[in-house]
């Protein structure tokens, strides 16, 4: 009886099992009982990354500099191009189809995790004892100045946005 299922790396067509084309090659013609599957290598800037019966190769992804993208890894006949973002930007999606500028942490917030090409800046509110008085994509929350270690006293309490103000101790008469 004609086969109803085929082995791995084969496909069923016209009651016959034909070899799939290897990664990096596309299907030109199905096998017959007299000749094997005819495959051709993908062209420049094309790829196929699986054993396949595709009649067209996929185009490599274009890393559009106008969208803030650059090539992280050049594509081959078997792999797609991998894009990443230019310095100071990160991808807007898993597929990195566009980039946006890294977020800055507002005053009162510090950087918990610095942004990468694929993830945005993670900010955290400055806890008691810490402050940030700038909008920054790099600055962490800084600890308030310790007046005591300078033999000074707190003249103005710190906030999450301002440091304490130290001053001399009142002298006892």
């Amino acid at each position: 009886e004609p086969p109803t299922a085929c082995r791995e790396k084969q496909y069923l067509i016209n009651s016959q099992c034909c070899s799939l084309c290897q990664p990096g090659q596309k299907l030109v013609s199905d096998c017959t009982e007299f000749t094997e599957t005819e495959c051709l290598p993908c062209g420049e800037s094309e790829f196929l990354d699986t054993w396949n019966r595709e009649t067209h190769c996929h185009q490599h992804k274009y890393c559009d500099p106008n969208l803030g993208l650059r090539v992280q890894q050049k594509g081959t006949s078997e792999t797609d191009t991998i894009c990443t973002c230019k310095e100071g930007q990160h991808c807007t999606s898993k597929d990195c189809e566009a980039c946006v500028l890294h977020r800055s942490c507002s005053p009162g917030f510090g950087v918990k995790q610095i942004a990468t090409g694929v993830s945005d800046t993670i900010c955290e509110p400055c806890p008691v004892g810490f402050f940030s008085n700038v909008s920054s994509a790099f600055e962490k929350c800084h600890p308030w100045t310790s007046c005591e270690t300078k033999d000074l006293v707190v003249q103005q309490a710190g906030t999450n946005k301002t440091d304490v103000v130290c001053g001399p101790q009142d002298r006892l008469r």
Partner: antibody, heavy 117, light 107 residues
Framework: EVQLLESGGGLVQPGGSLRLSCAAS????????MSWVRQAPGKGLEWVSG????????YYADSVKGRFTISRDNSKNTLYLQMNSLRAEDTAVYYC??????????WGQGTLVTVSS | DIQMTQSPSSLSASVGDRVTITCRAS??????LNWYQQKPGKAPKLLIY???SLQSGVPSRFSGSGSGTDFTLTISSLQPEDFATYYC?????????FGQGTKLEIK
Amino acid sequence: EVQLLESGGGLVQPGGSLRLSCAASGFTFSSYAMSWVRQAPGKGLEWVSGIGSYGGGTYYADSVKGRFTISRDNSKNTLYLQMNSLRAEDTAVYYCARYVNFGMDYWGQGTLVTVSS
Amino acid sequence: DIQMTQSPSSLSASVGDRVTITCRASQSISSYLNWYQQKPGKAPKLLIYAASSLQSGVPSRFSGSGSGTDFTLTISSLQPEDFATYYCQQYGRNPPTFGQGTKLEIK
């Protein structure tokens, strides 16, 4: 024992017709692709035509396309080659062969076709 | 059609010799190549399929290798019954095509 026996060869004039037969025995004929291969006197082998198993597709060399027709009768375990518009360059020994995994593992003894006026 | 070119066209050798016949395809055919032996007045006989697999019943002194466009048939130690004509045949593209043959003669 697998056996393939060709018949139907002979002398024919240019433009004439001939029908070759290949009687198969010793195997399940319908399960195998079959082909015709020819060999001109003192020359090499030339694949002429093939027919798939289970009534599969038919395939031809460019040199015979439109003139030769391959067919099979699974109930009679017989392969045929209808040859029309014969030319002098079709003169050859014609072999039928059984196909398995893209190779011809059993061949007949051949039948001679001579096209001459 | 794919052209298959064998070399040499003829070859003289002695019993016990190691003999190599080459076959070149006009374009890549992966490992989709068979080798046949034909003796005068007889039908061809399949020796090697898929470039390097020995057909059942064929002596192990016969071996095949190669892929892409260049293939070889090797007989490790010639026996008297090996003097014949050898053909390569591709099945990577329709239609299947044969090489022109290599005639192996006794020296």
